[in-house]
């Protein structure tokens, strides 16, 4: 039985192979039970967590994880050397930066050590699974009487990231948002000096260095407006 698994992270070529044992028709071998899907995320290209739902197993099982890179110099099968645990049962594996090769096909295999034929293999494009750290050091500059410029920093190469800026006033019920490319600058041309504004930003590893769907966490918000500091009306950055 060869089953295609569609993951929520753009890896449509992901496949899983489930190996069945021969069995009488009136009984179901444990080997037919599908293994949980493995979900991997690469955090800021610093480390990667590959996790699975250990509670989906009918009984507590320490599943094992192996990985390799398809058609590359790194095609030797590697054992997980740093397991993550949930209630003393393996639920994931953490790989360090030196083990992450973004543009090679990453193959991850989950196995039940008590039933070696019960295993599932997935192929992942790691460049589509990168989640950067949240933007930092948000600052606002007053360019003119009614124009504000928002700047921020990322702990990754700017040209690999796109951004989403959200802002609203205390009078608004919802956020207004705008996409920003790798230049990571945002201007608000018309600011009402009587209102207090809140801004926040998140970033994504797309489209230059990967095609990730997942955004970073939101930055800490930054505020501008009616209760701004009187000392310097041209630069004000207050983190909530």
């Amino acid at each position: 039985l060869n089953t295609t698994i569609l993951t929520p992270n753009g890896n449509e070529d992901t496949t899983a192979d489930f190996f069945l044992t021969t069995m009488p028709t009136d009984s179901l071998s444990v080997s037919t039970l599908p293994l949980p899907e493995v979900q991997c995320f690469v955090f800021n290209v610093e480390y990667m967590n590959c996790t699975w739902n250990s509670s989906s197993e009918p009984q507590p099982t320490n599943l094992t994880l192996h990985y390799w890179y398809k058609n590359s110099d790194n095609d030797k099968v590697q054992k997980c050397s740093h397991y993550l645990f949930s209630e003393e049962i393996t639920s994931g594996c953490q790989l360090q930066k030196k083990e992450i090769h973004l543009y090679q096909t990453f193959v991850v295999q989950l196995q039940d050590p008590r039933e070696p034929r019960r295993q599932a293999t997935q192929m992942l494009k790691l460049q589509n699974l990168v989640i950067p750290w949240a933007p930092e050091n948000l600052t606002l500059h007053k360019l003119s009487e009614s124009q504000l410029e928002l700047n921020w920093n990322n702990r990754f190469l700017n040209h690999c990231l796109e951004h989403l800026v959200q802002y609203r006033t205390d009078w608004d019920h919802s956020w207004t948002e705008q996409s920003v490319d790798y230049r990571h600058k945002f201007s608000l041309p018309s600011v009402d000096g009587q209102k207090r504004y809140t801004f926040r930003v998140r970033s994504r590893f797309n489209p230059l260095c990967g095609s990730a769907q997942h955004w970073s966490e939101w930055s800490h918000p930054i505020h501008w407006g009616s209760n701004t500091s009187k000392e310097n009306p041209f630069l004000f950055a207050l983190e909530a």
């Epitope: 290209v45 058609n71 973004l102 543009y103 090679q104 190469l157 040209h159 690999c160 489209p207 230059l208 260095c209």
Partner: nanobody
Framework: QVQLQESGGGLVQPGGSLRLSCTAS????????MTWARQAPGKGLEWVST????????AYAASVEGRFTISRDNAKSTLYLQLNSLKTEDTAMYYC??????????PGQGTQVTVSS
């Protein structure tokens, strides 16, 4: 073994143009973003431009935007950089590198661009 060979540099007057090439081998060229960087005399390595693996997205340093154009031909495993409206401050050794320009792996041998009247 990854090999990158840059070519196309030379001496050019301010306002002139050059086209740099980088021929790659030893890896799956079409799977990787590719980057141009440069190093001026006595300066550190400066990122210039990066292109996505499929060529569909590009990014440029502010100092070269609008003057330089990065492109690639995956069938030929070749990366290009078109340099127009050259300025004296563009004088540098130009390197291509596999990936998005994080400094690993090391670039190739480079090609020298000198802008002088």
């Amino acid at each position: 073994q990854v090999q990158l060979q840059e070519s196309g540099g030379g001496l050019v007057q301010p306002g002139g143009s050059l086209r740099l090439s980088c021929t790659a081998s030893g890896f799956s060229f079409s799977s990787y973003p590719m980057t141009w960087a440069r190093q001026a005399p006595g300066k550190g390595l400066e990122w210039v431009s990066t292109i996505a693996s499929d060529g569909g997205s590009t990014a440029y340093a502010a100092s070269v935007e609008g003057r330089f154009t990065i492109s690639r031909d995956n069938a030929k495993s070749t990366l290009y950089l078109q340099l127009n409206s050259l300025k004296t401050e563009d004088t540098a050794m130009y390197y291509c590198t596999k990936g998005y320009g994080d400094g690993t792996p090391a670039p190739g041998q480079g090609t020298q661009v000198t802008v002088s009247s």
